[in-house]
């Protein structure tokens, strides 16, 4: 139990005010009313309150809300929401975008800390899915977020979300992320037409199967290197080199470059060597001529 | 079961002191705010006093400053309110109330008990 | 201190009739710190509403809460014979805790 001192005469705070920076961390514990302290939360991130201060007001809102703030006060936490626990932030109920803005506004510029992220996924949860707006919210604070989901988490993800995704959103998520996401980047920017809907997709394009690639090959794209790059391996094997050369475009040349980095390596393995000459390039490593190509995947698949 | 039960009323001469108990039970005593809340014959409620639970922050209506005190004893689930310098007007009920402070409203109420300050 | 003003002091209505009581503070109180309470004689106040909207449990939905900044409404939409009562508002934004004096609602 908190030893309890008696708040000494004339010292009892009416309100949230400057007076208390000269405040000991006893007096503030017996002189400030939670309940007031509550009421005037938009008043503590203007006063200049030490952290050992900011201890004792997060300890009066735990005595006033032992189940978890309510979200009047979360709103208004500014930095003392950096004194709160994940097990603090788990007691919460976030539902508005605005409170969730202005608690990230306080870590911004520092990396996604255990608190930040313990209260987007209590936010998320709230939601049941990451719309548009909150996505658009994350990513603007961090770039970063999307790739940090599971795929299980990044199939919530509706397609109309998708629209609010920014290239460099994508830069850190693996093949298995992209896998969930691009099927939803496809029906979201399905009815926009042939050059415009490249470049929506591109950065989604980890995620493509084959017969899209083979779709996209027929529409001059002009691929560049760096997404070709990112392409599965396995969609990008049973790509022709005249698929290729169509997907690439001019950007074709920059195979020489990658040719020993997969999927380029992996793919120039699979090609005739006569095909490969075609384009000039002097790849190396196709199949010679005259030797006969078993897939063996459609032979297991057959028996 | 929320139920809170007060006791100590009576009849007292001005000046004189009395000590009013609130035995709560059916909920965390040691997690509530709570109130005192009188009501002077054929009047209406007046807000008294409350305290908090953990460091027994106290707050008090003008009327009853430096003559009444709250206290609590979180071992007991009781609430007190001391009230010394008893004058003609502190005559009323006073009711002990829980503050629920997620609805910021005293969300129970005790039945009250009946102070009178007469010679 | 945030004063409370009840009006009317007296309401004088049938059963089946709708009630409108208002209250007014002395200054803007945040809708989450004003209440709502009933007072039958004899008895102690019961919670009607709290967050100047919210109905507490166990009260019927004929009771609903409206208002913010300095104006706040308790509305019955039709009077029930058990609801001939005082009733109270309340704010828990500043020390002390002030009620309005209330307002009667007797039958007519």
């Known amino acids: 139990e908190v030893e309890k001192t008696a708040c000494p005469s004339g010292k009892k705070a009416r309100e949230i005010d400057e007076s208390l920076i000269f405040y000991k961390k006893w007096e503030l514990e017996a002189c400030v009313d939670a309940a007031l302290l509550a009421t005037q939360m938009d008043r503590v991130n203007a006063i200049p309150f030490t952290y050992e201060q900011l201890d004792v007001l997060k300890h009066k809102l735990d005595e006033l809300y032992p189940q978890g703030y309510p979200e009047s006060v979360i709103q208004h936490l500014g930095y003392l929401f950096l004194k709160m626990s994940p097990e603090d932030i788990r007691k919460w109920n976030v539902t508005s975008l605005e409170t969730l803005k202005a608690l990230l506004e306080v870590n911004k510029g520092h990396e996604m800390s255990p608190q930040v992220a313990t209260l987007i996924d209590r936010f998320v949860k709230g939601r049941g899915q990451l719309d548009k707006d909150t996505l658009d919210t994350l990513t603007a604070f961090y770039p970063g977020y999307l790739c940090s989901l599971s795929p299980e988490e990044l199939s919530s993800v509706p397609p109309s979300s998708i629209w609010a995704v920014r290239p460099q959103d994508l830069d850190t998520c693996d093949p298995r992320q992209l896998d969930v996401l691009y099927p939803k980047a496809r029906l979201a920017f399905q009815n926009m037409n042939g050059s415009e809907y490249f470049v929506k997709i591109q950065s989604f394009l980890g995620g493509a199967p084959t017969e899209d690639l083979k779709a996209l090959s027929q529409q001059n794209v002009s691929m560049d290197l760096a997404t070709f790059m990112k392409l599965r391996t396995d969609a990008v094997l049973p790509l022709t080199v005249a698929e290729v050369q169509k997907l690439l475009g001019p950007h074709v040349e920059g195979l020489k470059a990658e040719e020993r980095h997969r999927p380029v390596r992996d793919w120039i393995l699979r090609q005739r060597q006569d095909d490969l000459d075609t384009l000039g390039l002097g790849l190396q490593g196709g199949i010679p001529n005259g030797y006969l190509v078993l897939d063996l995947s459609m032979q297991e698949a057959l028996s | 079961e929320v139920q809170l039960l007060e006791s100590g009323g009576g009849l007292v001469q001005p000046g004189g002191s009395l000590r009013l108990s609130c035995a709560a039970s059916g909920f965390t005593f040691t997690h509530t705010y709570m109130s005192w809340v009188r009501q002077a014959p054929g009047k209406g409620l007046e807000w008294v006093s409350n305290?908090?639970?953990?460091?027994?922050?106290?707050n008090y209506a003008d009327s009853v400053k430096g003559r009444f005190t709250i206290s609590r004893d979180n071992n007991k689930n009781t609430l007190y309110l001391q009230m010394n310098s008893l004058r003609a007007e502190d005559t009323a009920v006073y009711y002990c109330a829980r503050y629920n402070a997620y609805h910021a409203a005293l969300d129970y109420w005790g039945q009250g008990t009946l102070v009178t300050v007469s010679s | 201190e945030i004063v409370l003003t009840q009006s009317p002091g007296t309401l004088s209505l049938s059963p089946g009739e709708r009630a409108t009581l208002s209250c007014r503070a002395s200054?803007?109180?945040?809708?989450?710190?004003l209440a709502w309470y009933q007072q039958k004689p004899g008895q102690a106040p019961r919670l009607l509403i709290y967050g100047a909207s919210s109905r507490a449990t166990g009260i019927p939905d004929r009771f609903s809460g409206s208002g913010s900044g300095t104006d706040f409404t308790l509305t019955i939409s039709r009077l029930e014979p058990e609801d001939f009562a005082v009733y109270y508002c309340q704010q828990a934004l500043g020390y002390p805790h002030t009620f309005g004096q209330g307002t009667k609602v007797e039958i007519k």
């Open positions: 200054q803007s109180v945040s809708s989450s710190y």
């Open positions: 305290i908090s639970p953990t460091y027994s922050t106290t």
